[in-house]
Interface confidence: medium
Amino acid sequence: TQNKALPENVKYGIVLDAGSSHTSLYIYKWPAEKENDTGVVHQVEECRVKGPGISKFVQKVNEIGIYLTDCMERAREVIPRSQHQETPVYLGATAGMRLLRMESEELADRVLDVVERSLSNYPFDFQGARIITGQEEGAYGWITINYLLGKFSQKTRWFSIVPYETNNQETFGALDLGGASTQVTFVPQNQTIESPDNALQFRLYGKDYNVYTHSFLCYGKDQALWQKLAKDIQVASNEILRDPCFHPGYKKVVNVSDLYKTPCTKRFEMTLPFQQFEIQGIGNYQQCHQSILELFNTSYCPYSQCAFNGIFLPPLQGDFGAFSAFYFVMKFLNLTSEKVSQEKVTEMMKKFCAQPWEEIKTSYAGVKEKYLSEYCFSGTYILSLLLQGYHFTADSWEHIHFIGKIQGSDAGWTLGYMLNLTNMIPAEQPLSTPLSHSTYVAHHHHHHHHHH
């Protein structure tokens, strides 16, 4: 007779990534007895919540409960009922909510409060909802990709898990692009981190890491586009804005009130003698690139070297994983292959942006027009940000790996966040016996979460 399989001794964790444009729920699973090992936690499910980011619910907080229902119900189905009560749930909100908090602390609190009340209605172990800092977002993204790549493991393998994995223990840098912010995080080579705000110290699995990180608020792809439009309409002095970042023949009416709604456009705000203007695409990569560069102030730098806007950036070092929108956009444009040089990417972008809008709509009939229309801008923005913003070159471009998933888990900050909050990244090399909490990593961003 066949042996009956023993019940798996596994644990689950849930993290909700409340981004500026949407919310995603991730379910992670790991063997209970191996929770201190590196690389054992993996993602079993991603559920994308239908609708915008939570910051958009500021005037309709009563709809937040319904908004979260489908994905929370999905979590109920995926995770065995017997595990529900011990499955932690964390919600981390990023730059969309940081911007809302800048506008009004009270409104941001109101949104988070309703989110917390909604999530505490489920049978899981809800650990709270909070706005994570840009530094945390960068740090946890870095932890995620290096954890998944096996960089923290002391056992060097003779085989590679993933095509871009190098067989050494040098960590990968992390490049994260969201809708409202972008993060750059890496271990510089013997370089003093001249700005304390950008320095993180970790001890992970018995090794010390001095990590550089910075989050550029307002430089996510969506907010960068709003910035660019606000900058350009200042000069246009007309109700028509001929825009090189949109395909020839593309037209869209924009409300000035929408343009000035975000704190990101405040520096360009002026009294315009019209309430609306029309974007008319002219599809010119080079001109789009030039326009984007005006968003980066490179004339001021109080350090040995800067990215832009006076923010310290050490010399780039090693390989980088570029994920989130860096990946989604480049994947759409079919530019994620390791073999595609920076010159080739630029060439492809020139061709893509110059394609007439009607042609683009026909070629990508299944793609929502709102998203489709912005790929020319987003692709050009990615190139501008990486080359002029972060000072990658045609040569160092080869060290950027556009990553969607590693070993089936999405690259992003959520896994690193959960590993830290569940104390699953030990500061010292795990022994055969479980360690006390005191030996776990506790870098200076570890906030205690309240239980409901």
């Epitope: 350009d232 200042q234 000069v235 246009a236 002095s237 007309n238 109700e239 028509i240 804005l241 001929r242 825009d243 090189p244 003698p273 019209f274 008319q280 002219i282 010119n284 001109q287 030039q290 326009s291 005006e294």
Partner: antibody
Framework: QVQLVESGGGVVQPGRSLRLSCAAS????????MHWVRQAPGKGLEWVAY????????YYADTVKGRFTISRDNSKNTLYLQMNSLRAEDTAVYYC????????????WGQGTTVTVSS | DIQMTQSPSSLSASVGDRVTITCRAS??????LIWLQQKPGKAIKRLIY???TLESGVPSRFSGSRSGSDYTLTISSLQPEDFATYYC?????????FGQGTKVEIK
């Protein structure tokens, strides 16, 4: 092809009025902002006034503010400059030029029409 | 108002010479500058926009560049048809302002 043709210039006494026209063809006039620019004899170019495509925006140089009015008739593809209380220093060749950010900023100009203010 | 200081006001050069004309902006204009060419009896012609973008149909011997608040028009090898007056114009704010002009004459 794009054409801008100014007319309405002439000799006029100080204090009197004159209306200049600029007839546009070869492009979608109603999409473009339009400028008037002038050049006094032997001098450089001086910007005078601007009107947006839908006439909702008008800008004037301080030297003509309150005396000159820019207007347009999109159905007739025509730009106008109504000049009142003319002074000797308004004597110049007046040019119209089209404007559309990003790539069509003052990219086509007319040949100009001469206005002489003299008693 | 933004002042555009153009220099030189005139220059004499020979065919084949390299010629540079500079405009300095009194305030930040962020590259919003065009270069114009004026010849007697002809319509004014735009050569360069956005400080460095060459108008289609304009010979490649013309180029525009920027260094801080200084904007330069360069004619790499002067041709007989290039003898004219050149103006810069800023379009970052109103009132639009021109440089004083540079007359390029035959030596």
């Amino acid at each position: 092809q794009v054409q801008l043709v100014e007319s309405g210039g002439g000799v006029v006494q100080p204090g009197r009025s004159l209306r200049l026209s600029c007839a546009a063809s070869g492009f979608t006039f109603s999409d473009y902002g339009m400028h008037w620019v002038r050049q006094a004899p032997g001098k450089g170019l001086e910007w005078v006034a601007y009107i947006s495509s839908g006439s909702s925006i008008m800008y004037y140089a301080d030297t003509v503010k309150g005396r000159f009015t820019i207007s347009r008739d999109n159905s007739k593809n025509t730009l106008y400059l109504q000049m009142n209380s003319l002074r000797a220093e308004d004597t110049a060749v007046y040019y119209c030029a089209r404007d559309l950010y990003y790539d069509h900023v003052l990219d086509y100009w007319g040949q100009g029409t001469t206005v002489t203010v003299s008693s | 108002d933004i002042q555009m200081t153009q220099s030189p006001s005139s220059l004499s050069a020979s065919v084949g010479d390299r010629v540079t004309i500079t405009c300095r902006a009194s305030q930040e204009i962020r590259g919003y500058l065009i270069w114009l060419q004026q010849k007697p009896g002809k319509a004014i012609k735009r050569l360069i926009y956005a400080a460095s973008t060459l108008e289609s149909g304009v010979p490649s011997r013309f180029s525009g560049s920027r260094s801080g608040s200084d904007y330069t028009l360069t004619i790499s090898s002067l041709q007989p048809e290039d003898f004219a007056t050149y103006y810069c114009l800023q379009y970052t704010s109103y009132p639009r302002t021109f440089g004083q002009g540079t007359k390029v004459e035959i030596k």
